[in-house]
């Protein structure tokens, strides 16, 4: 029974997207009165794990020495104090990459594009998948997330960009996934560098490091344009 105790804080170290085989630590932080910590994983018998608190008792560590498919999923944690169990933490979604072979990322008509023109990034998988993600290198979130309408399996997804500006320049990768577990992603594609050359009206600025797509309205690199791609995939913002 969840009591009036404040909910604990749950996070993953080094972060919540982990490559297959790499280590990750899940931390649950409660209060100094905590006597025990419990970690629950969605769709697994509860509790998934229990740990005694580390001194000074306000934190517990759940170690995953080698990431596999079994660990990917949605977690919540609780702590027990002398007055009962806490409310659940906010969920932690632990994603594993490397579950499937890497897709291929290409640019049509070319990765060299003039500012103001259009380009489409094409992510292709060898086996049919129903979800494709596009990321800009070192960005904290996928730029676009394409999922098929009715779970239909696709070999590719198109990510149109129009009109292209200097902000679109940079290195991109894509991932593919099956809808039955969006916590399992493929290996990343090889990187694709998109080079945007300036026009007379839009001189190319000096190169800068790629920035997160959430940098502000003027820095949003991928505004969805045009109709739904021919692949039959629906476009979603992450």
């Amino acid at each position: 029974q969840a009591g009036p105790l404040p909910k604990p804080t749950l996070w993953a170290e080094p972060g919540s997207v982990i490559s297959w085989g790499n280590s990750v630590t899940i931390w649950c932080q409660g209060t100094l009165e905590a006597r025990e910590y419990r970690l629950d994983k969605e769709e697994s018998p509860a509790p998934w794990d229990r740990q005694n608190p580390l001194e000074p008792k306000n934190k517990a560590r759940f170690s995953i020495p080698s990431m596999t498919e079994d660990y990917a999923g949605r977690y919540r944690c609780y702590y027990r104090s002398p007055v009962g169990w806490s409310q659940p933490s906010d969920p932690l979604e632990l994603v594993m990459t490397g579950a499937y072979s890497k897709p291929t990322l290409s640019a049509l008509p070319s990765p060299l594009v003039t500012s103001g023109k259009s380009v489409t990034l094409l992510c292709q998988s060898r086996s049919p998948m129903d979800t494709f993600l596009l990321i800009k290198e070192r960005a904290a979130h996928p730029l676009l997330h394409l999922r098929s309408e009715h779970g239909a399996q696709q070999h590719q997804a198109e990510f149109p960009m129009s009109p292209v500006t200097s902000v679109h320049g940079g290195t991109y990768r894509c991932f593919s996934s099956h809808g039955f577990s969006h916590y399992l992603l493929s290996h990343p594609s090889d990187p694709l560098e998109l080079i945007v050359s300036g026009s007379l009206e839009d001189p190319r600025p000096s190169p800068t490091r790629s920035v997160s797509t959430a940098a502000g309205p003027e820095d949003q690199p991928l505004m969805p344009t045009g109709s739904v791609p021919h692949s039959g995939l629906r476009r979603h913002w992450e």
Epitope: W11, S19, F175, A214, G216, D219
Partner: antibody, heavy 123, light 108 residues
Framework: EVQLQQSGPELVKPGASVKISCKAS????????MDWVKQSHGKSLEWIGY????????GYNQKFNSKATLTVDKSSSTAYMELHSLTSEDSAVYYC????????????????WGQGTSVTVSS | QIVLTQSPAIMSASLGERVTMTCTAS???????LHWYQQKPGSSPKLWIY???NLASGVPARFSGSGSGTSYSLTISSMEAEDAATYYC?????????FGGGTKLEIK
Amino acid sequence: EVQLQQSGPELVKPGASVKISCKASGYTFTDYNMDWVKQSHGKSLEWIGYIYPNNGGTGYNQKFNSKATLTVDKSSSTAYMELHSLTSEDSAVYYCASSPYYDYVGSYAMDYWGQGTSVTVSS
Amino acid sequence: QIVLTQSPAIMSASLGERVTMTCTASSSVSSSYLHWYQQKPGSSPKLWIYSTSNLASGVPARFSGSGSGTSYSLTISSMEAEDAATYYCHQYHRSPRTFGGGTKLEIK
């Protein structure tokens, strides 16, 4: 453009405390861990710890457990590090650096660094 | 904690020369979590190579990185004046994050 702007140099007396700030701009503050790194004069880099601004989760190098306290103010996208009971050994340049919490390539490298804050402990 | 040992501590190279520096870990490190930073005097470190072999944005193609397990290296195919700096390797395979002692690269 991503920027981490740190507070200015500090001259403090032994035994005192100091609080350094690091204001982030150009990205979503809560999507990146903020790490803190120490560099003594002419020496290598030492990791102090991190804070995950989204929920305040922290991890420390045990060596700095009782030396440093990391906090954030989400409303101003600012991270803070307070150093306690300062001695001459704490004289150094301190950097904040951000690493993505959702790193799809899985590297968790420190992408962006502040310009550094020099702390001098002297009586 | 994982100790990273860089060698040599100081090296000098002529312009156009091929340069290799190494980073040896006291225990095995995932290649995903091994990075290199460049630092010039009076400046902050910059991410230079991440996950062993990926060049950070803006890093010239003459740089490359390789390795696995306990042995990693950074190579410059043809030394240029702007490459003179200190290079640090860094791991986050296991907490605490640790850095190597650095290799200072000078122009001969």
